[in-house]
């Protein structure tokens, strides 16, 4: 779970090992702050829980791509 050290900076210290279906994920944000020990992705789930994940993992990248496509407005 993400940890807010000095708000508003939120950092991840551990990543989930478990692969999670993109259908459980609602959105994500990248953590790139130099105040954090590592780069991370924080997924927000459909039930509003937050999960720290490793942006180097393929399933994480695939999930971000899927969520990006899901939020793009269709061209008319």
């Amino acid at each position: 779970q993400p940890d807010a050290i000095n708000a508003p900076v939120t950092c991840c210290y551990n990543f989930t090992n478990r692969k999670i279906s993109v259908q459980r994920l609602a959105s994500y944000r990248r953590i790139t702050s130099s105040k954090c020990p590592k780069e991370a992705v924080i997924f927000k789930t459909i039930v509003a829980k937050e999960i720290c994940a490793d942006p180097k993992q393929k399933w994480v990248q695939d999930s971000m791509d899927h969520l990006d496509k899901q939020t793009q407005t269709p061209k008319t």
Epitope: I20, R24, T45, I51
Partner: antibody
Framework: QVQLVQSGAEVKKPGASVKVSCKVS????????MHWVRQAPGNGLEWMGG????????IYAQRFQGRVVMTEDPSTDTAYMELSSLRSEDTAVYYC????????????WGQGTLVTVSS | DIVMTQSPDSLAMSLGERATINCKSS????????????LVWYQQKPGQPPKLLIY???IRESGVPDRFSSSGSETDFTLTISSLQAEDVAVYYC?????????FGQGTKVEIK
């Protein structure tokens, strides 16, 4: 392809504990979210608990809280479910179950372990 | 907790007949942002673990015959076997996976008349 192989049937006396194992192959246990579901004779399916990546920890159904412990041994890719203070109503088939990408449903099941509680 | 209620508890049909099982959830299992219903159906035969039949409320698992179909949204779902076969004799369960604790319906036993 995930495969789950469970330990054999057990007979226990009321008040005792039982520990059921579930060996994973074809996948690394720590990549999966392993859960346990039980089924009493002639009854339906009842979720007992399991690892929930959304909480980052093992969660348990309220009715088993304090009586069940689910653990993992990553070195052997084996999950365990230990139920204590057994009573006759705990006589059931216990299943471990999971899926490759955690969604909340189960597409891989162990073969089941019958636990009989009898004096 | 989301309570799942199936009806009927059991049904007996002739071979080739259409069998319908209903599943009702105490609250919606639809996530509107992706328009997905977090509901699955399992089939369980005696002495075997449950087998996944349908997920996301309407998608058949690979290898499941097309006589099995499911429909519904939010709180009301239906599993249909269009032409009952002898090998379909089993207990069928719905399960919601919108939020924990993950909950199952009580099951519907399907028999041949």
């Amino acid at each position: 392809q995930v495969q789950l192989v469970q330990s054999g049937a057990e007979v226990k006396k009321p008040g005792a504990s039982v520990k059921v194992s579930c060996k994973v192959s074809g996948y690394t246990l720590t990549e999966l979210s392993m859960h346990w579901v039980r089924q009493a004779p002639g009854n339906g399916l009842e979720w007992m608990g399991g690892f929930d990546p959304e909480d980052g920890e093992t969660i348990y159904a309220q009715r088993f809280q304090g009586r069940v412990v689910m653990t993992e041994d990553p070195s052997t890719d084996t999950a365990y479910m230990e139920l204590s203070s057994l009573r006759s109503e705990d006589t059931a088939v216990y299943y471990c179950a999971t899926n490759e990408f955690w969604s909340g449903y189960f597409d891989y099941w162990g073969q089941g372990t019958l636990v009989t509680v009898s004096s | 907790d989301i309570v799942m209620t199936q009806s009927p508890d059991s049904l007996a049909m002739s071979l080739g007949e259409r069998a319908t099982i209903n599943c009702k959830s105490s609250q919606s299992v639809l996530y509107s942002s992706n328009n997905k219903n977090y509901l699955v159906w399992y089939q369980q035969k005696p002495g075997q673990p449950p087998k996944l039949l349908i997920y996301w409320a309407s998608i058949r698992e690979s290898g499941v015959p097309d006589r099995f179909s499911s429909s519904g949204s939010e709180t009301d779902f239906t599993l249909t076997i269009s032409s009952l076969q002898a090998e379909d004799v089993a207990v069928y369960y719905c399960q919601q996976y919108f939020s924990s604790p993950w909950t199952f319906g009580q099951g519907t036993k399907v028999e041949i008349k």
